[in-house]
Interface confidence: low
């Protein structure tokens, strides 16, 4: 059976296509090519007579066609108008005509696309941005890339207009890009230059550093404030509610206890119109901001009830601290038999009773800090009662 094949099937505009013929019958008078799916004299491109080996152009001939003795048709410098069906009619020597139809598709060599945007300076969590890939061309696939990756699945990303438009709903600061669009057809592809978004956001809640709260008199107080913001935030400082200066950093040399108070950093973004503040308490004191863990010791940890006494000692190297004692989560002393001495460092129990058995610990504290010792266990034994009836245990 007579067939035709387009080489290639998808042709780039300006290139050439060869309509190949397969299974051409042996005994022929001639053949003709027509534009379209049927034989139409008005749309004949060329006729070829085998006997004279002469080609005759038809009404649809554009001067770009060449017919070969094997009936193949070459079309050069193709345009998109050449897209479609082509029909070959073979006039055999038995005067029976045979026909075959083939087709090809002409695609343009795509230009470098560009991205247009309805808003290149959106505000975070407020604005949507629509990117459009230009130009609009027929038979073109539009692809989008964010950070050189294909589009992630996200409810905030919407494609429309045949994928030519990419909409970002409610932009975030992480949506800066870069964004690229790519246009493809079967014969060519091209990618745009990257486009980035300048997302306006913030300020976020400021952070004051360092995180220290306690300072010694005579030290330098240097505080820095930072809030994520685009454009960068403008900063100001207040101490105990009173404006000090409009800087990102606050420096006070040789501080005294009078510099204790509330330090407020105020961050402002003039574009978003948003403000955020953070308050930090600064305490200037001679006291140690961290009290070390005290050690607890017992004169003995196993005693005989109603007979023995015991001394528990709480040791610490810190100065300016107070000590308190606890037994089973209760504050001591809790009975007349318990006495505190040596600035509460020693707890004496005399005599020890059954109810005194259990866990003891001490806590050292000053006005700004406290710390507890590990617990210590006091065991209280009683001498065994004599056996009844003089029976020995057995």
């Amino acid at each position: 059976q007579l067939t035709t094949e387009s080489m290639p099937f998808n042709v780039a505009e300006g290139k050439e296509v060869l309509l190949l013929v397969h299974n051409l019958p042996q005994q022929l008078f001639g053949y003709s090519w027509y534009k379209g799916e049927r034989v139409d004299g008005n749309r004949q491109i060329v006729g070829y007579a085998i006997g004279t080996q002469q080609a005759t152009p038809g009404p649809a001939n554009s001067g770009r066609e060449t017919i070969y003795p094997n009936a193949s048709l070459l079309i050069q410098n193709v345009t998109q108008n050449d897209t479609g069906f082509y029909t070959l009619q073979v006039i055999k020597s038995d005067l029976v005509n045979e026909e075959a139809t083939g087709q090809f598709h002409v695609y343009p060599e795509l230009p470098k696309p560009s991205i247009s945007s309805n808003n290149s300076n959106p505000v975070e969590d407020k604005d949507a941005v629509a990117f459009t890939c230009e130009p609009e061309t027929q038979d073109t696939t539009y692809l989008w890339w964010i950070n050189n990756q294909s589009l992630p699945v996200s409810p905030r990303l919407q494609l429309s207009n045949g994928n030519r438009t990419l909409t970002l709903l409610s932009v975030t600061r992480n949506d800066t890009g870069p964004y690229e669009c790519e246009i493809q057809n079967p014969v060519s592809a091209n990618r745009s230059d990257p486009v980035t978004l300048n997302v306006t956001y913030g300020p976020d809640t400021p952070t004051i550093s360092p995180s220290d709260t306690y300072y010694r008199p005579g030290a330098n107080l240097s505080l820095s404030c930072y809030a994520a913001s685009n454009p960068p935030a403008q900063y100001s400082w207040l101490i105990n509610g009173t404006f000090q200066q409009s800087t990102q950093e606050l420096f006070i040399p040789n501080i005294t206890v009078n510099n204790s108070g509330s330090y407020t950093c105020h961050a402002n973004n003039s574009v978003t119109g948003c403000n955020r503040t953070t308050v930090k308490t600064i305490i200037v004191t001679e006291l140690s901001p961290v009290v070390a863990k005290p050690q607890i010791k017992a004169s003995k940890t196993t005693v005989t009830g109603d007979k023995d006494s015991v001394n528990l000692t709480c040791s610490t190297n810190d100065t300016g601290i107070s000590i308190r004692w606890f037994f089973k989560n209760q504050s001591l002393p809790s009975s007349e038999r318990m006495k505190l001495s040596q600035g509460n460092t020693t707890l004496s129990i005399n005599p020890v009773k059954r109810e005194d058995a259990g866990t003891y610990w001490c806590e050292v504290f000053n006005p700004i800090s406290k710390n507890q010792s590990d617990p210590i266990m006091l065991n209280v034994n009683y001498n065994a009662l004599p056996q009844e009836n003089g029976l020995s245990p057995g």
């Epitope: 290639p8 998808n10 780039a12 790519e182 079967p186 014969v187 592809a189 091209n190 990618r191």
Partner: antibody
């Protein structure tokens, strides 16, 4: 996981022919331009040829034009290099490499392990 | 003779910063993107930098690329012993209609 596996290398006499294959897996082969790059023993890298993702565009290094032919079968996820009229200077490890940019910013992000072609009598 | 010119060798001690240069012309580096590849002994090349300065995912930020005019460079900071390898630059050449590589730079980490 992206994988490129070359095969078909071996010892061949000068003037002889060889056909290299590169089996691709772990990605959509028909979406990527593919290249062959070679490295002679103890020498640097030399690009050999590239074929576009659809096979419509092909380029060769001047040193191999007319002797080496690149092709691809997207249905088989395979890249080929037909090597004819081989010379001693074609002796090298031949790598196939993937271009993730479709040729807009040519680069090779994945390479095969290479196959050695030795041309010697 | 390679179309792109690289120094044959470079060296540095651990922790140091080293830079490898790559010189070309307007038909390659001047008008096309540059890539950098690392080839460890006995292995296939590995892409580090593409499009002049973009780091491939998974490549440490100690590696950075830059380009100016018809020259490009690869910088490696905080040098490590495992960075000892051959480094190649590459770019498309519009005049040759082909991809071109530099001759390669052998990086030695001393000490």
């Amino acid at each position: 996981e992206v994988q490129l596996l070359e095969s078909g290398g071996g010892l061949v006499q000068p003037g002889g022919s060889l056909r290299l294959s590169c089996a691709a897996s772990g990605f959509n082969f028909s979406n990527y331009a593919m290249s062959w790059v070679r490295q002679a023993p103890g020498k640097g890298l030399e690009w050999v040829s590239v074929i576009s993702h659809g096979g419509g565009s092909i380029y060769y290094a001047d040193s191999v034009k007319g002797r080496l032919t690149i092709s691809r079968d997207n249905s088989k996820n395979t890249l080929y290099l037909q090597m004819n009229s081989l010379r001693a200077e074609d002796t090298a490890v031949y790598y196939c490499a993937r271009d993730p940019t479709k040729g807009y910013a040519p680069t090779f992000d994945y390479w095969g392990q290479g196959t050695l072609v030795t041309v010697s009598s | 003779q390679s179309v792109l010119t690289q120094p044959p060798s470079a060296s540095g001690t651990p922790g140091q910063r080293v830079t490898i240069s790559c010189s070309g012309s307007s038909s390659n580096i001047g008008n096309n993107y540059v890539s950098w590849y690392q080839q460890l002994p006995g292995t296939a090349p590995k892409l580090l930098i593409y499009a002049d300065s973009k780091r491939l995912s998974g490549v440490p930020d100690r590696f950075s690329g830059s380009k100016s005019g018809t020259s490009a460079s690869l910088a490696i900071s905080g040098l490590r012993s495992e960075d000892e390898a051959d480094y190649y630059c590459g770019a498309w050449d519009g005049r040759l209609n082909g991809y071109v590589f530099g001759g390669g730079t052998k990086l030695t980490v001393l000490g």
